[in-house]
């Protein structure tokens, strides 16, 4: 946020640039949380803008029993590697079909034991303020899904009628990884010292991080005709003086009017 | 990149005996899979059968077994299917598939490299 000045007093200006604001030589460009000619605002409203979509990803091992391992399958540049990754992705692609998160799978690792398939699943969801849910419920229908398959898809005197076969027993879900995303703990620390008065409020689904001197929200404070003033002891409303009314009060709701005042002291001289 | 040819196919009374051939090129190693499938007109592709060429596996589907071997010569890169006692049932487009995979499996989407086919007729 910047405020360009023009004229002499701008060397003045230079050395009171506030709250670690500085002086390019025409005005004072403000940290993010700061606006005003001199940096001396605190601002109403952080962007804490959400990635549009949350990853989460999980590791599985399966065994496959229809492939008989070779030593080149633990080389990934190898044809046999890569030949075996064309066919377990397309079999992967099949089994998780139904799961709208669904992004494909990576293969970290094949071992011996027919051949053992460490990977990852990875499944992606657009960002809501249900993101967790929605990943845990995706999550859950893959291994269903894959526990199914594992179970179905088996080998029948020594033999494979299906893309692949599994062991039904060599189905493990090692670990789940979700992208962390917590826009209250965003909006805390990029408010900073300021942390206890911003909060977080959706609206379309879109958390913004505001204080209560940002107008349209509910937490929003109503200064009336003042100005909402945010300092290190919360919100304050600054009233004004019209060329007819005094304004007072916490929300600037009080109006005393000039002339009642001054007809009062005139009646005193 | 695996390049498979067929020939040898023809028409045969039944009875008769045919021998078909897959030549192979475009390959890195020499433990892969080969295998003989069929389709007759208006079914699916089916498995006639499957070798490995380490030596280590072969299968053949119930209906021919008994009349047809599958072998191979691994310094010709060459895959034969050598098809005796010829029945109508018999007649399909057979193609010669590969991996370069051991697979175990019958199922013709697990077999990435194919053939473009040759016609087997049995009829009198």
């Known amino acids: 946020r910047t405020t360009t000045c023009f004229g002499d007093g701008c060397q003045n200006t230079a050395s009171r640039c506030k709250n670690g604001g500085t002086w390019d030589g025409l005005k004072c460009q403000c940290p993010n949380l700061y606006y005003g000619e001199l940096c001396e605002e605190v601002v109403s409203s952080i962007d804490i803008g959400p990635p549009e979509t949350i990853s989460a990803q999980m590791e599985l091992t399966v065994t496959v029993t229809s492939v008989k391992f070779t030593e080149e399958l633990k080389n990934h540049s190898s044809q046999e590697f890569q030949e075996f990754k064309q066919t377990f992705t397309e079999q992967m692609n099949i089994v998780y079909s139904g799961i709208p998160e669904y992004v494909g799978v990576n293969i970290t690792k094949l071992r011996l034991g027919s051949v053992v398939v460490e990977h990852d699943v990875l499944l992606r969801t657009k960002y809501t303020p249900e993101y967790k849910t929605v990943l845990d419920n995706a999550t859950e229908v893959v291994k269903e899904k894959i526990t199914k398959v594992t179970t179905q898809q088996i080998m029948i005197n020594d033999i494979c009628s299906d893309m692949m076969c599994f062991n039904t027993t060599g189905t493990q879900v090692q670990n789940i990884t979700v992208t962390q995303y917590d826009p209250e703990e965003d909006c805390r620390k990029m408010a900073k010292e300021y942390g206890d008065y911003f909060v977080v409020e959706y609206r379309d689904q879109k958390p913004y991080c505001i204080s209560p001197c940002e107008p349209g929200f509910s937490v929003s404070k109503n200064c009336n005709l003042g100005k909402c003033q945010m300092s290190l002891s919360g919100p304050q409303c600054l009233c004004v003086t019209t060329e007819t009314h005094w304004y007072s009060g916490e929300t600037c709701n009080q109006g005393t009017q000039k002339s009642l005042v001054y007809g009062h002291h005139h009646h005193h001289h | 990149e695996v390049q498979l040819v067929e020939s040898g196919g023809g028409v045969v009374q039944p009875g008769g005996s045919l021998r078909l051939s897959c030549a192979a090129s475009g390959y890195t190693s020499n433990r892969y899979s080969m295998a003989w499938f069929r389709q007759a007109p208006g079914k699916e592709r089916e498995v006639v059968a499957f070798?490995?060429?380490?030596?280590?596996?072969?299968y053949y589907a119930d209906s021919v077994k008994g009349r047809f071997t599958i072998s191979r010569d691994n310094s010709k890169n060459t895959l034969y299917l050598q098809m005796n006692s010829l029945r109508a049932e018999d007649t399909a487009v057979y193609y010669c598939?590969?991996?370069?995979?051991?697979?175990?499996?019958?199922?013709?989407?697990?077999?990435?490299?194919w053939g473009q086919g040759t016609m087997v007729t049995v009829s009198s």
């Open positions: 598939a590969a991996s370069s995979l051991l697979l175990q499996t019958i199922n013709p989407r697990a077999w990435p490299y």
């Open positions: 070798i490995w060429t380490d030596g280590g596996r072969t």
